[in-house]
């Protein structure tokens, strides 16, 4: 990337922010205040929320959010079209599915409209920020006298994109036992005791085939298998397909 060095002509980009040595100390102090970090999450690929802590501002400020995608063809940013508010102050932005492109770098810019120099830009990989809905329709069936199979349904369109965490415990256990299940919607427990009541629940995350999200979905509603024959709780819970 060689070039001839050209002297500045004074014909500089007037769209960039102006700078004057006579700026007041007060405005300089405001302009150097850090802006809050923006947290964005894509919910099941259906919409995205980007939020910030509006209460971190020293005085109530309607910060503006612009966003765009960084690629080789264009780098157009647009302002949020659907702000979220907290105590009548902007605190987030809702983006519809049509604005979500998981595999391009998402750029979000937060700005104080009263102080043009006070702005912050973040880069995010949206494929690492997908949070699926909780698994649904948990079903238990006996594969044999002592073997159980748990299966469930995802509400994310691409099953292979999700890994799952199954937790189970009996009424005799104080801690959950957990098992990670990759890219399938079932889990087998080879040995169960019919005298115990078992509780099962599942959660999912967008990892690792389609993204590297660290956030899990919420837990599914639990399902139960077996019986509790203690005198204090003489009830039976059986869920079978």
């Amino acid at each position: 990337l060689n070039s001839t060095v050209l002297k500045p002509s004074g014909n500089e980009d007037t769209t960039a922010d102006s700078f004057s040595t006579s700026e007041t100390l007060e405005s300089l102090n405001i302009s150097t205040l850090p802006l809050p970090e923006v947290q964005c999450f894509v919910f099941n690929g259906e919409y995205m929320n980007c939020t910030w802590n509006s209460s971190s501002e020293p005085q109530p400020t309607n910060l503006t959010l612009q966003y765009g995608y960084k690629n080789s063809d264009n780098y157009k940013v647009q302002e949020c079209g659907h702000y979220k508010f907290s105590k009548e102050i902007t605190s987030g932005c809702w983006l519809p599915k049509s604005e979500i492109r998981l595999y391009e770098t998402f750029v979000v810019r937060l700005q104080d409209p009263r102080e043009p120099r006070r702005q912050m830009e973040q880069k995010l990989k949206l494929q690492n920020l997908v949070i699926p809905w909780a698994p649904e329709n948990l079903t238990l069936r006996n594969l044999s006298e002592s073997q159980l199979e748990l299966s469930w349904k995802n509400r994310y369109a691409l099953d292979h994109c999700l890994q799952h965490l199954v937790q189970y415990r009996s009424d005799w256990d104080s801690n959950w036992t957990e098992q990670q299940v990759d890219h399938k919607q079932s889990f087998s427990l080879p040995s169960v005791d019919g005298q115990k009541l078992y509780t099962f629940r599942v959660r999912s995350r967008f990892n690792p085939l389609c993204g590297s999200a660290q956030h899990w979905s919420k837990w599914s509603h639990p399902v139960y298998w077996g019986s509790n024959i203690s005198k204090e709780n003489p009830w039976l819970f059986i869920t079978k397909a």
Partner: antibody
């Protein structure tokens, strides 16, 4: 990318450095400024993004301005009230279109602040 | 501002060995970490971005990894030409910030 600067600046004076680029458009790529004092590490100064907006190093914001002339493919760094500890090599660097960091750097221009 | 800390200012290794340079961010930077190599008298060169994506033309002996606040650059089978300063940098949020650098010396 090629930087050009004054070389020597007197304390309390202003610094103007020009970065002239070729092979890409300033409306498609961000350009960053980074400096390196002698024998020390890299310090990010600021950026002018493809769309023309800017971000600055928090500690230096009050002294810095970055702007550009798209038609001449030039970016300008201006810094006020220089002190001896502003002595450094000043680099401009391009942020790639598909690379989310600084993928090409100029050779740098040495600025010495001394009376 | 996010502080990037490279705890080792100097590291020494032999040709053919493997070495790992570490970098710690003061907060989660969501894998938005780049690594640069700066040889004596030269401008920095980009090696890795987004923690693990190798830049075009970078030899595959350079590998980046990490998440959250902890990141590493591993050079497997170190070559004599790898003698350089290595800097990490977060590109998650402005202002961008660099680590203090790690100087790799060849025994």
């Amino acid at each position: 990318l090629q930087e050009s600067g004054p070389g020597l600046v007197a304390p309390s004076q202003s610094l103007s450095i020009t970065c002239t680029v070729s092979g890409f458009s300033l409306t498609s790529y961000g350009v960053h400024w980074v400096r390196q004092p002698p024998g020390k590490g890299l310090e990010w100064l600021g950026v002018i993004w493809a769309g023309g907006s800017t971000n600055y190093n928090s500690a230096l914001m009050s002294r810095l301005n970055i702007n550009r002339d798209n038609s001449k493919s030039q970016i300008f760094l201006k810094m006020n009230s220089l002190q001896t500890d502003d002595t450094a090599i000043y680099y401009c660097a391009r942020e790639g279109s598909t690379v989310d960091s600084m993928d090409y750097w100029g050779q740098g221009t040495t600025v010495t602040v001394s009376s | 501002d996010i502080v990037m800390t490279q705890s080792h200012k100097f590291m020494s290794t032999s040709v053919g060995d493997s070495i790992t340079i570490t970098c710690k961010a003061s907060q989660d930077v969501t894998t938005a970490v780049a690594w640069y190599q700066q040889k004596p008298g030269q401008s920095p060169k980009l090696l890795i971005y987004w923690a693990s994506t190798r830049h075009t033309g970078v030899p595959d002996r350079f590998t980046g990894s990490g998440s959250g606040t902890d990141y590493t650059l591993t050079i497997s089978s170190v070559q004599a030409e790898d003698l350089a300063l290595y800097y990490c940098q977060q590109h998650y949020i402005t202002p961008w910030t660099f680590g203090g650098g790690t100087k790799l010396e060849i025994k």
